[in-house]
Amino acid sequence: MAVTACQGLGFVVSLIGIAGIIAATCMDQWSTQDLYNNPVTAVFNYQGLWRSCVRESSGFTECRGYFTLLGLPAMLQAVRALMIVGIVLGAIGLLVSIFALKCIRIGSMEDSAKANMTLTSGIMFIVSGLCAIAGVSVFANMLVTNFWMSTANMYTGMGGMVQTVQTRYTFGAALFVGWVAGGLTLIGGVMMCIACRGLAPEETNYKAVSYHASGHSVAYKPGGFKASTGFGSNTKNKKIYDGGARTEDEVQSYPSKHDYV
């Protein structure tokens, strides 16, 4: 029962997380113009991984894609790569985890196969979450560095009469979405790995073996001894999914949430 709940919850949390990673990757507001201590401009600049946008006070918004590949900073390329790897791993993880769900029966799939698939998807979710967190953190670090560099520039080289206000950028909404989404995917992955331990059929009942001691007719029969590897409760003889808190119909509704992935 607890294993199914953990697995199901891990799947749902990871699903939300991956949807968030996709949303963050597509969002334009990775960095936004810093308005604090700045002259009030009638133009608001913000940038994403794929394009930069300008919103005018008139309400018009103009976005321009980064049509060059070689001309982009290596860090931006690295962030793009991390986010895409995170999405791909997450999507594969979701696909694998659907078939691994204990409440979904596919032919005569063994519990051991489901346990392996659960572990695989869990690891994929963990790596996916780490990729997203790393990508967002690299971008955030890049912003902080550039922010202080441009702040230094603002207060130097002002010898002339004409001032040129340098646009400084600060954290955009996408960074927070990315961090939260990456964290959720990571948590979901950990939950899947925990559920895997509960799914693994680790019990082995050793057959009784008679040891004939010389000169004695005493038989040692340690029958029923459980060899455990510390993976938790035995699931071989328990139908955990019977009478569980979640019906098959309810669980079947989850995959529809990630049709767009």
């Epitope: 009030v40 009638a42 600049n45 300008v54 008139s58 309400g59 004409v162």
Partner: antibody
């Protein structure tokens, strides 16, 4: 065609208030910001402020903050500019205009002359 | 506030001749986000409302004759009428559209010599 039609000329006494209307036609009123600009006789143009009819968001020039009130009526596709505590130096032609790319003003009303005289 | 300074205050040019109006802002009007200059040029004929000529310093508004051209970047801008026509007699204004409050130049009166 796109046009902004303003209310007629007004004569007011010092200390009074004036409310000028600007009716938009030929476009979706809520899709464009409306600015107000004034021009004293023989003088240059002076920006007063703007209102976004979509969300009633407004911004004022410091000089008119607290004295001018910009409002709009979506159902009537009309923007309003009310100026209180009128002084003789407020005598001017008041224009409404529609905001365009680059925060420029592409369509202007015909202007409303406000005369302040005791 | 941003100060917009136009020169000259008035200009008398012969028909068919070139007229050049300069506009200088106290701060750069170049937006780094889209590399566009937020400067607008207007024409105001006697007794009429202003008419938009150029936005983003050099983007011509539809219906504006191509004898008009706008140029410049940062703080220095120019409006040029390559061949002055009788109907071009007007006052020309530049406007800062980058910083609040939006400010206009004092205007340049163009007349026929």
């Amino acid at each position: 065609q796109v046009q902004l039609v303003q209310s007629g000329a007004e004569v007011k006494k010092p200390g009074a208030s004036v409310k000028v209307s600007c009716k938009a036609s030929g476009y979706t009123f809520t899709s464009y910001v409306v600015h107000w600009v004034r021009q004293a006789p023989g003088q240059g143009l002076e920006w007063m402020g703007y209102i976004n009819p979509y969300n009633a968001d407004s911004k004022y020039s410091q000089e008119f903050q607290g004295r001018a009130t910009l409002t709009s009526d979506k159902s009537a596709s009309t923007a309003y500019m009310e100026l209180s505590s009128l002084r003789s130096e407020d005598m001017a032609v008041y224009y409404c205009s529609r905001s365009y790319y680059g925060n420029s003003f592409d369509v202007w009303g015909q202007g409303t002359l406000v005369t302040v005289s005791s | 506030d941003i100060v917009m300074t136009q020169s000259p205050d008035s200009l008398a040019v012969s028909l068919g001749e070139r007229a050049t109006i300069n506009c200088k802002s106290s701060q750069s009007l170049l937006n780094s986000g889209n590399q566009k200059n937020y400067l607008t040029w207007y024409q105001q004929k006697p007794g009429q409302s202003p008419k938009l000529l150029f936005f983003w310093a050099s983007t011509r508004q539809s219906g504006v004759p191509d004898r008009f051209s706008g140029s410049g970047s940062g703080t220095d801008f120019t409006l040029t009428i390559s061949s002055l026509q009788a109907e071009d007699v007007a006052v020309y204004y530049c406007q800062n559209d980058y910083y609040f409050p939006f400010t206009f130049g004092q205007g340049t009166k163009v007349e026929i010599k």
